[in-house]
Interface confidence: medium
């Protein structure tokens, strides 16, 4: 989907971000249409995530003069991960295997996958409100990092988990940055 917006972009100030595990999420995923891939390992002692570890970030947005009425909730995609066990990276084979190559796991990173364009309202000191569109991350995915390329390279091999349903007016591809532009 190509967004036809011609809105002016504004810089912003973001207040400190406390991160919370997705299990503590206060977002109603049924309400927001989200079916996020759970970050469940193969066994409880696993040190590397199977799929992505999805952290919840809560922050207030400001345009310098006005601040968001309610905190913005989004995902932060971070850390190492492993592709789904159907991929040929597993040692020992079989559905019940609990062991995998530590070396290969280090080539996989959890990055932004799905985003949505969301409207926010900012409250101003004079009592007025302002409205903007911002892009927030709604799902993460495990991507394979090709080591011979620079860290800033976009040479990724993608393994997407279950596609999250979105119920949003505009949908955009995620950038690797989680910074917001007000528009």
């Amino acid at each position: 989907f190509k967004n036809d917006a011609t809105e002016i972009l504004y810089s912003h100030v973001v207040k400190p971000v406390p991160a919370h595990p997705s299990s503590n999420s206060t977002l109603n995923q049924a309400r927001n249409g989200g079916r996020h891939f759970s970050s469940t390992g193969l066994d409880r002692n696993s040190r590397v995530q199977v799929g992505c570890r999805e952290l919840r970030s809560t922050k207030y947005i400001s345009d310098g003069q006005c601040t968001s009425i309610s905190p913005l909730k989004e995902l932060v995609c971070a850390g190492e991960c492993l592709p789904l066990p159907v991929l040929p990276n597993w040692i020992g084979g079989g559905y019940g295997t609990k062991y995998w190559s530590r070396r290969s796991s280090q080539e996989w990173r959890c990055v932004n996958d799905k985003t949505r364009t969301q409207r926010i309202q900012l409250q101003c000191q004079d009592g007025s409100t302002r409205t903007y569109k911002i892009t927030v991350v709604t799902a993460c995915k495990c991507k394979r990092y090709t080591r011979q390329h620079n860290e800033s390279s976009h040479n990724f091999e993608s393994v997407s988990p279950a596609k999250p349903a979105q119920h949003h007016r505009e949908r955009k591809r995620a950038s690797k940055s989680s910074k917001h532009s007000l528009s």
């Epitope: 989907f1 967004n3 036809d4 917006a5 011609t6 809105e7 002016i8 504004y10 977002l27 309400r31 927001n32 249409g33 009425i69 309610s70 913005l72 909730k73 949505r116 969301q118 409207r119 926010i120 309202q121 009592g127 007025s128 409100t129 302002r130 409205t131 903007y132 569109k133 349903a165 979105q166 119920h167 949003h168 007016r169 505009e170 949908r171 007000l182 528009s183």
Partner: antibody, heavy 123, light 107 residues
């Protein structure tokens, strides 16, 4: 009380332009996107586009991009839609409508509508 | 663009009856559907958003359900003042699109 008061009916000639106004009251004008919708017997309801009163930024339905221009005047809490190069197919009722969304930023729908402005294109 | 199809252009019902209006999306729109009521000579009025959320002040007899591509709007006990055209609208992607409308007629 939230109100959207639209300008009166227009009778215009083919090829001409018309500018419809929508004056908002009862809420913070810059706090909500303003949408415009066309209603004709042939095509039911069609979304034309929306404007952010805070920034003046617009998003158009591709179908209406060459037809409609959306603007706002924050000082008077008024949204405008100009329609150009009018033909008989543009004869319709046009509505402005405030976009409702929850505090979580989703759940979009148009919760307050103007009374509509009838535009008739005839020679 | 996503096409919203309301298969029934007209529906006839009696006061006190339960009536359901259906709407089908041409692709998955999750729960991003709103329902509007338009009475003769009036502007549309928002009843339901996000498929099942009743807008402020809307009577409890109006309900919405569905997700994906199939949606239903129900009036549990039709009143005489419910005579109107009902429209579904998807707000999943731009441009938002409306169904053709279902006119509810009271017998």
């Amino acid at each position: 009380e939230v109100q959207l008061q639209q300008s009166g009916p227009e009778l215009v000639k083919p090829g001409a332009s018309v500018k419809i106004s929508c004056k908002a009251s009862g809420y913070s004008f810059t706090g909500y996107y303003m949408n415009w919708v066309k209603q004709s017997p042939e095509k039911s309801l069609e979304w034309i586009g929306e404007i952010n009163p805070t920034t003046g930024g617009t998003t158009y339905n591709q179908k209406f991009k060459a037809k409609a221009t959306l603007t706002v005047d924050k000082s008077s809490s008024t949204a405008y839609m100009q329609l150009k190069s009018l033909t008989s197919e543009d004869s319709a009722v046009y509505y402005c409508a405030r976009l409702h969304y929850d505090y979580d930023g989703v759940g979009y729908a148009m919760d307050y509508w103007g009374q509509g402005t009838s535009v008739t294109v005839s020679s | 663009d996503i096409v919203m199809t309301q298969s029934h252009k007209f529906m006839s019902t009696s006061v006190g009856d339960r009536v359901s209006i259906t709407c089908k999306a041409s692709q998955d729109v999750s729960t991003a559907v709103a329902w509007y009521q338009q009475k003769p000579g009036q502007s549309p009025k928002l009843l339901i958003y996000s498929a099942s959320y009743r807008y402020t002040g809307v009577p409890a007899r109006f309900t919405g359900s569905g997700s994906g591509t199939d949606f239903t709007f129900t009036i549990s006990s039709v009143q005489a003042e419910d005579l109107a055209v009902y429209y579904c609208q998807q707000h999943y992607s731009t441009p938002p699109t409306f169904g053709g409308g279902t006119k509810l007629e009271i017998k």
